[in-house]
């Protein structure tokens, strides 16, 4: 869906240098706005801290997979 006009845009300018344990992560959102210098993942931790991460890194993709799989309703 199109972005709301004049909606505030959150961008990431630097990425974390360290791998974060999935046990510390609560959710993620992707940054895709053309107004930002780079695509990014923003992880929110269980203590509500937001951390920018590089979506090209394998640990980042694995962490996103983990968070998504956690929320799937089991189908029998």
């Amino acid at each position: 869906q199109p972005d709301a006009i004049n909606a505030p845009v959150t961008c990431c300018y630097n990425f974390t240098n360290r791998k974060i344990s999935v046990q510390r992560l609560a959710s993620y959102r992707r940054i895709t706005s053309s107004k930002c210098p780079k695509e990014a993942v923003i992880f929110k931790t269980i203590v509500a801290k937001e951390i920018c991460a590089d979506p090209k890194q394998k640990w980042v993709q694995d962490s996103m997979d983990h968070l998504d799989k956690q929320t799937q309703t089991p189908k029998t």
């Epitope: 869906q1 959710s27 993620y28 959102r29 992707r30 895709t32 053309s34 695509e39 979506p55 090209k56 993709q61 996103m64 997979d65 968070l67 998504d68 799989k69 929320t71 799937q72 309703t73």
Partner: nanobody, 124 residues
């Protein structure tokens, strides 16, 4: 700017097959989970299938499980939906979307950058 373009829809008889494609541009495609949804006239948008960024995990609605297969080719920035044993109730506009929020693969609010869709009509 992110763009998604679907193709491959058409008119097919019940029991037939179609293969839909969704070509993406304007994003680092290989790092995004993707999904297929459908919307029939007068009905709400319905989840069909989803795939994670690397293509190792797939998820399906119960109504299409065993008949539809989602896949992706990150080299050409495209996802596919192979639809077999089609039924009249599969008739809808099929759209792909990019998953940008964590959470259930079947929840439309978790997705953004929807394509315009491709019409699939299954006649009896």
């Amino acid at each position: 700017e992110v763009q998604l373009v679907e193709s491959g829809g058409g008119l097919v008889q019940a029991g037939g097959s179609l293969r839909l494609s969704c070509a993406a541009s304007g994003l680092t495609f290989s790092t995004y989970p993707m999904g297929w949804f459908r919307q029939a006239p007068g009905k709400e948008r319905e989840f069909v299938a989803a795939i994670n960024s690397g293509g190792s995990y797939t998820y399906y609605a119960d109504s299409v499980k065993g008949r539809f297969t989602i896949s992706r080719d990150n080299a050409v920035n495209t996802i596919y939906l192979q639809m077999n044993s089609l039924k009249p109730e599969d008739t809808a506009v099929y759209s792909c979307a990019v998953k940008i929020y964590s959470g259930s693969y079947s929840s439309p609010p978790g997705y953004n950058h929807w394509g315009q869709g491709t019409q699939v009509t299954v006649s009896s």
